[in-house]
């Protein structure tokens, strides 16, 4: 089904695993714990998912409803320009940054913010639902 690619469009998929929220054609996991950016990415990859890559302003607005003032890591990094983990550039929103050393992207209910990648924050994973259900 959607298992071929982490970034494929996920149409008419079954429901999401336990603790994941279905929104549109994807499953989202909002963490309770905190990790640094790399470890958040690792957490998502181990569960056949990826750190949240936001495709457009509409998806961003929908997700922000579930967020608070607390920042969450997403799949966004400044590597010669802000790029999502699927390689696409950030082109539909601005990101606030206070320093050159803040090279990882986070989101809260107010928007996108650059942060130092070592800071432990909550995170959001995104994946396609799978036909066979598992806890992850």
């Amino acid at each position: 089904l959607c298992q071929g690619s982490n970034y494929s469009t996920c149409a008419s998929c079954p429901s999401c695993p336990d603790r994941w929220m279905k929104y549109g054609n994807h499953c989202y996991y909002f963490s309770v714990e905190e990790k640094d950016w790399n470890s958040s990415l690792e957490f998502c990859l181990a569960r056949d998912s990826h750190l949240l890559v936001i495709t457009d302003n509409q998806e961003m607005s929908l997700l922000q409803v579930f967020l608070s003032e607390a920042f969450c890591w997403i799949g966004l990094r400044n590597n010669s320009g802000w790029r999502w983990e699927d390689g696409s550039p950030l082109n539909f929103s601005r990101i606030s940054s206070n320093s050159f050393v803040q090279t990882c992207g986070a989101i809260n209910k107010n928007g996108l913010q650059a942060s130092s990648c070592e800071v432990p924050l909550h995170w959001v994973c995104k994946k396609c639902p799978f036909a066979d259900q598992a806890l992850f």
Epitope: R19, V32, E34, K35, S39, A46, R47, V119, L135, F136
Partner: antibody, heavy 120, light 107 residues
């Protein structure tokens, strides 16, 4: 109830390899990551890595890459760790552990430990 | 890697004492600290998770606190069955790392 049953003690020669097992009981095997932890006599704990039995995904502590290989056999609900090119530094008790709730690295269930002794 | 430092390798205590075991992280780990108890010849046992939450079945004399880099496990009314090694662990960053342990001994 949840139980992790590890294989028995091993005495192995330097340079050899050893494969130890961790059999899971009392829960759905593919729903919980299996972690492996090393403890040398009278010393602290060292996280080796984990394997997700659902998809085989592994995450190793860099320190143990090339030393430990983690695998699972879903049909028997058993996780394995193979240690290669053994030296005296590898003599230790090795534990498998799961967090059970699956989403946090707090290890609520542990195997009884497998003592590996490397000696000529 | 994040280093978890338990500066006291041994602590002498008496039954009924209030005992505080400290653990310091080399960088901010938020509240992602776990505490374990290990008795000789046994596997570690989970006591505290997320710095301050007592795990199921753990007596309420065990409390954890701290955030950021400094963490404490307190036993409010030391019992003889509490004589053991205590380890802290951080979950903020891979590789997961543990403190070297603090052994509680009778005075």
């Amino acid at each position: 109830q949840v139980q992790l049953q590890q294989s028995g003690a091993e005495l192995v020669r330097p340079g050899a390899s050893v494969k130890i097992s961790c059999k899971a009981f009392g829960y759905t095997f593919t729903n919980h990551f299996i972690n492996w932890v090393k403890q040398r006599p009278g010393q602290g704990l060292d996280w080796i890595g984990y394997i997700n039995p659902y998809n085989g995904y592994t995450n190793y502590n860099q320190k143990f890459k090339g030393k430990a290989t983690l695998t699972v056999d879903k049909s028997s609900s058993t996780a394995y760790m193979e240690l290669s090119s053994l030296t005296s530094e590898d003599s230790a008790v090795y534990y498998c552990a799961i967090s059970y709730d699956g989403y946090y690295e707090r290890f609520a269930y542990w195997g009884q430990g497998t003592l590996v002794t490397v000696s000529a | 890697d994040i280093v978890m430092t338990q500066s006291q390798k041994f602590m002498s205590t008496s039954v009924g004492d209030r005992v505080s075991i400290t653990c310091k992280a080399s960088q901010n780990v938020g509240s992602t600290v776990v505490w374990y108890q290990q008795k000789p010849g046994q596997s570690p046992k989970l006591l505290i998770y997320s710095a301050s939450n007592r795990y199921t079945g753990v007596p309420d004399r065990f409390t954890g606190n701290g955030s950021g880099t400094d963490f404490t496990l307190t036993i409010s009314n030391m019992q003889s069955e509490d004589l053991a090694d205590y380890f802290c662990q951080q979950c903020s960053s891979y590789p997961l790392t543990f403190g070297a342990g603090t052994k509680l001994e009778l005075k």
